[in-house]
């Protein structure tokens, strides 16, 4: 069943069918001898009751106030009272843009990212008995789509995809064609799950060490899951047997990110190892980021300023 | 609109320099690196270098490395690629595109070297 | 530097028939950590750039058809086109971007037969 129109304030189109629906349906059905009112109330006009002789365009079905179709004069506040049961609504009928689909304050925002999934269905559970055929536009442009009783597109969104969608549902009552438009205007962002990697530490770093001796580098990035880290040395890596890459750690951070750590481990430090540039770059699709050690003999560490020292 | 515009045609003598621009717009700049390839007349694709548009670091095929210098402009959303002394054989048509894998691609800038 | 060799360089298809290119690396593009291939697949077509059709060796780029896949893992990958249509023909290359430099294959060039 189609539910309540529980929102107090309420902007519609003129031209449209459109319906109220009070939210004591099911106590109403209880409960049928009871005295059920609808009221209006507009400006210098106090509670009116509304029946179906008020106007040819409204129609009462129990829980219902049904216009067919909506019109800028029925603009104001509506009153369902049952019993001590009283329920509100503030009802503005704006105008129909005639040089559109669609109208522009009436228009659904939403924010689809890049790749993801993105659905639109066309559907209008109150009308859909009512309903002949439904057709979707974009950007007032009719697709063409097989369903033509529900249109739907559902795919991995593209930067194209961006635009306004409008399902026009058409229906006849009582002999008159009437549709009803609903409009979303679609933003496709980029996926900002994304994060620019970051190495941490400094980016240049002096390791003082002994000749004969093992170090090991430590190379730690915040990074995306599909990001790469590795290191770079010598001509060709893999070229000197004392030096090892060891395996990747990676742990998940509480917000979804990864924290990556990379050892590369130079044993039997020789001569040749000393003041070489041993790199370690991270890569994402946002480019490449390095950090650089180089191995100095402790010997030599008075000739460097303390502060770039990793021990 | 998602889009890399490349600047026009160039013809340079050898030993020249030339600048090739590609503006990128509807999309976030510095959050895709920019790689160029070139593609010499009837020949397959050559991966020039990247520049990471948010933080500048590059990265240079090695046979470029001293005659290619790569840079962005982040207020304009442009980057450029240089190329110094110019031979015959840079005779090309060089592409600018987005990421690592290049779902976004250029239309493409001819240079032609010729004495 | 990795090296990526496509076989073969030229391939004719009939219409509707499946055409498969393959593609080699000098040195594995599988990413442990995350066991992703760092591959892509590309269409070029006289007068344009290159289009992507597959990343990740085997994800296909949105708006590209069905009738194209990518499959393989490490160091040997095969790009599928399960029934050619005459719009296919076209050099198409693939490309590392495990390592800097980013390389590509040669390209294979496919023709209707």
């Known amino acids: 069943a189609e539910s309540c129109t529980s929102r107090p304030h309420i902007t519609v189109v003129e031209g449209e069918p459109f319906y109220l629906k009070h939210c004591s349906c099911s106590l109403a059905h209880e409960i049928e001898t009871t005295t059920k009112s609808w009221y209006k109330s507009s400006g210098s006009q106090e509670h009116v009751e509304l029946n179906p002789r008020s106007s040819s365009r409204i129609a009462l079905h129990d829980c219902v106030l049904e216009f067919w179709p909506v019109e800028l004069n029925d603009t104001g506040s509506y009153f369902f009272q049952m019993k001590n049961y009283t329920q509100k609504w503030k009802l503005n009928v704006i105008r129909r843009n005639k040089h559109s689909c669609f109208t522009e304050r009436q228009v659904t925002s939403k924010i689809v990212e890049v790749k993801k999934f993105f659905q639109i269905t066309c559907e209008n559970s109150y009308y859909q008995t009512l309903v002949n055929s439904t057709s979707l536009y974009k950007n007032c442009k009719k697709l063409l789509l097989e369903n033509n009783k529900n249109p739907t597109i559902k795919k991995n969104a593209e930067f194209e995809d961006q635009g306004y969608y409008s399902c026009v549902h058409f229906l006849h009552h009582n002999g008159k064609l009437f549709n009803i438009t609903k409009t979303f205007n679609i933003t496709i962002v980029e996926d900002r799950s994304n994060i620019v990697p970051v190495l941490l530490g400094p980016k240049l770093n002096h390791v003082a060490v002994e000749l004969g001796k093992n170090v090991r580098l430590n190379c730690s990035a915040l990074l995306n899951e599909e990001d790469v880290i590795y290191w770079m040395f010598g001509e060709e890596n893999g070229s000197d047997p004392n030096i090892h890459e060891e395996k990747e750690m990676r742990i998940m951070t509480p917000e979804g990110k990864w924290h990556a750590s990379k050892v590369l481990r130079i044993e039997n430090i020789g001569e040749s190892n000393l003041n070489v540039l041993y790199n370690c770059t991270v890569a994402s699709t946002g480019g490449t980021d390095t950090k650089s050690f180089i191995l100095v003999r402790k010997a030599d560490m008075a000739d460097i300023p303390g502060h770039v020292f990793t021990r | 609109q998602v889009q890399l515009v490349q600047s026009g045609a160039e013809v340079k003598k050898p030993g020249a320099s030339v600048k090739v621009s590609c503006k990128a717009s509807g999309y976030t700049f510095t959050s895709y690196g920019i790689s160029w390839v070139r593609q010499a007349p009837g020949q397959g694709l050559e991966w020039m270098g990247w520049?990471?548009?948010?933080?500048?670091?590059?990265n240079y095929a090695q046979k470029l490395q001293g005659r290619v210098t790569m840079t962005t402009d982040t207020s304009t959303s442009t980057a450029y690629m240089e190329l110094r002394s110019l031979r015959s054989d840079d005779t090309a048509v060089y592409y600018c595109a987005r990421g690592w894998y290049f779902a976004l691609w250029g239309r493409g800038t001819l240079v032609t070297v010729s004495s | 530097d990795i090296v990526m060799t496509q076989s073969p360089d030229s391939l004719a298809v009939s219409l509707g028939e499946r055409a498969t290119i393959n593609c080699k690396s000098s040195q594995s593009v599988l990413y442990s950590s995350n066991n992703r291939n760092y591959l892509a697949w590309y269409q070029q077509k006289p007068g344009q750039p290159p289009k992507l059709l597959i990343y990740w060796a085997s994800t296909r780029e949105s708006g590209v058809p069905d009738r194209f896949s990518g499959s393989g893992s490490g160091t040997d990958f095969t790009l599928t086109i399960s029934s050619l249509q005459a719009e296919d023909v076209a050099v198409y290359y693939c490309q590392q971007f495990y390592r800097t430099p980013y390389t590509f294959g040669q390209g294979t060039k496919l023709e209707i037969k």
């Open positions: 520049i990471s548009a948010y933080n500048g670091n590059t």
